[in-house]
């Protein structure tokens, strides 16, 4: 019968021929009367056989990632009779893996959005690299992830590629971050190959800023002939948040005379000071009112940022009109 060993050939061998193994029949007594033949895909081109000894050689450089095994057939013939000594038999030559492929991130580009001020440990995104080497062959395709850029705000779990927040971030200081992740095979041991990917992490806004008046003091004038409803001037606050979180409402906090009102222009986010009652120069020609501004929408859990509304003082001078 046939005497079988497992046949392996390392990929990417640079030698012109590499001894793979030997076909042998237990009837072969070594007197050179047997002729060994190799048949099948790769026979004669990738693999050759010494017909007298049965030694098989690989004569081409192999790439396991292209083809990981070859199924060949073996024959042995008695030269003197021309008959088969053994029944034709199928056998396998496996291409053994070497670490010749670096990890690759196939889902690039990566982009994630996470709310600003998210707590430490918040999951941002998972990145995954793949390595074309043999996962069952040592550590050639066993990957470890690490952070090359993004400290101290982000961390990556070494074995999963899960990116998490490691420090709170304020969108108003910086609204996006580029994180660079490296994947190394050989679980990071010497000789490891690596690949990198960039992740764009954008911070979405939360309402962590209250509106604040641009001026702590305003000066307006109103003619004593102005009818009620007259707009006598505008006041303005700013809010470092964006979108809905920056929408604000102005109101009167203090006006003993109850002469003025403030309405909000929601398009410009300005407060418009309105004359609510007609003024009389002879009766009162100087007014002082206090206005306040608050956000239109505030989540319950963000109330700590909005405890005290910003206020401003408005001095209003009445201009005399000569009466006939």
């Amino acid at each position: 019968g046939w005497v079988w060993n497992q046949f392996f050939v390392p990929e990417e061998m640079n030698t012109t021929s590499h001894h793979v193994g030997r076909l042998r029949s237990d009837l072969d007594n070594g007197n050179n009367s047997f002729q060994y033949k190799l048949l099948g895909a790769g026979a004669g081109s990738t693999f050759i056989i010494d017909e007298r000894t049965g030694d098989i050689y690989a004569i081409e450089k192999l790439d396991r990632e292209e083809r990981s095994l070859y199924i060949l057939r073996a024959q042995v013939i008695d030269i003197t009779t021309g008959r088969a000594v053994e029944p034709e038999s199928e056998f396998v030559i496996k291409v053994s893996d070497i670490n010749d492929n670096e990890p690759k991130f196939l889902d690039e580009p990566y982009e994630a959005i996470v709310p600003e001020m998210s707590p430490e440990g918040t999951l941002v995104i998972q990145v995954t690299a793949s390595d074309a080497d043999d996962p069952s062959s040592g550590n050639n395709a066993r990957l470890l992830y690490s952070l090359l850029q993004g400290q101290p705000y982000f961390s990556v779990e070494p074995t999963t590629g899960v990116i998490r927040i490691s420090s709170k971030m304020d969108r108003e200081l910086q609204d996006e971050y580029w994180v660079i992740i490296q994947a190394k095979d050989m679980i990071g041991q010497p000789g490891a190959l690596s690949g990198t990917t960039s992740v764009l992490i954008k911070l979405s806004d939360v309402n962590d800023n209250k509106p604040i008046f641009k001026e702590s003091l305003y000066r307006l004038t109103v003619s004593e002939s102005a009818p009620t409803g007259t707009s006598i001037g505008t006041i303005m606050a700013y809010d470092n948040d964006i979108g809905e979180n920056a929408e604000m409402d102005y109101s009167i906090e203090e006006d003993d005379s109850q002469t003025f009102d403030i309405i909000t222009n929601h398009e410009t986010q300005e407060g418009i000071v309105i004359l609510k009652k007609k003024v009389n120069f002879e009766h009162q020609n100087h007014y002082g009112i206090r206005a306040k501004v608050k956000n239109h929408h505030v989540d319950e859990q963000l109330m700590k940022y909005h405890t005290e509304a910003s206020t401003t003082f408005i001095k209003i001078q009445v201009e005399d009109v000569d009466e006939p």
């Epitope: 001026e215 702590s216 003091l217 305003y218 000066r219 203090e254 009162q284 100087h286 001095k315």
Partner: antibody, heavy 120, light 107 residues
Framework: QVQLQESGPGLVKPSETLSLTCTVS??????????WSWIRQPPGKGLEWIGY???????YYNPSLKSRVTISVDTSKNQFSLKLSSVTAADTAVYYC????????????WGQGTLVTVSS | EIVLTQSPGTLSLSPGERATLSCRAS???????LAWYQQKPGQAPRLLIY???SRATGIPDRFSGSGSGTDFTLTISRLEPEDFAVYYC????????FGQGTKVDIK
């Protein structure tokens, strides 16, 4: 801290024009919302407001003195000035310059005052 | 114009006593438009109270203001030696007028 300093002649002849200047330091005369006033106090008597000016040049005067008073401002020098024409002995007083407050028209900052005597 | 009348003209008290100074307006004014000043000889007036009960920066809490309509009061809870001076009220709603002053002197 805003500081104000009055300067000008201490003696003015009757029927002439009294001229005083107030120099502001520690803050800008162009600060939004603040008015700059002149107030006087005849010897041994009470306080009388003369008038104020805003940095834009808009002024408002005490009706009883309006015909004789001019207040002007020079933002480049951080100064404002008082001119009171046709003076008489009744205009003899300590003249103060002052700035109003951040929460009303009260007088928060005052100069130390300068005595102007009207006499021939 | 609004006339402010202060009373008494002179108040003679000892250190440690309570001083109550009155200011009456010739017509109603909003309490937000009244201030009190202290003046010592040879010095400029110093703002004490405005609006009518807010203390100016650096003013001790023994000074307090109250009132509404036409009647306003400045109270010094316990007179200190440095409190003996002339006190003026001022309204700043209809132009600017001052009371004639109340002198607080040592008894």
């Amino acid at each position: 801290q805003v500081q104000l300093q009055e300067s000008g002649p201490g003696l003015v002849k009757p029927s002439e024009t009294l001229s005083l200047t107030c120099t502001v330091s520690g803050g800008s005369i162009s600060s939004s919302g603040y008015y700059w006033s002149w107030i006087r106090q005849p010897p041994g008597k009470g306080l009388e407001w003369i008038g104020y000016i805003y940095y834009t040049g808009s002024a408002y005067y005490n009706p009883s003195l309006k015909s004789r008073v001019t207040i002007s401002v020079d933002t480049s020098k951080n100064q404002f000035s008082l001119k009171l024409s046709s003076v008489t002995a009744a205009d003899t007083a300590v003249y103060y310059c002052a700035r109003d407050g951040s929460s009303g028209w009260y007088f928060q900052y005052w100069g130390q005052g300068t005595l102007v005597t009207v006499s021939s | 114009e609004i006339v402010l009348t202060q009373s008494p003209g002179t108040l003679s008290l000892s250190p440690g006593e309570r001083a109550t100074l009155s200011c009456r307006a010739s017509r109603q004014i909003s309490s937000s438009y009244l201030a009190w000043y202290q003046q010592k000889p040879g010095q400029a007036p110093r703002l004490l109270i405005y609006g009518p009960s807010s203390r100016a920066t650096g003013i001790p809490d023994r000074f307090s203001g109250s009132g509404s309509g036409t009647d306003f009061t400045l109270t010094i809870s316990r007179l200190e030696p440095e409190d003996f001076a002339v006190y003026y009220c001022q309204q700043y709603g209809s132009s600017f007028t001052f009371g004639q002053g109340t002198k607080v002197d040592i008894k």
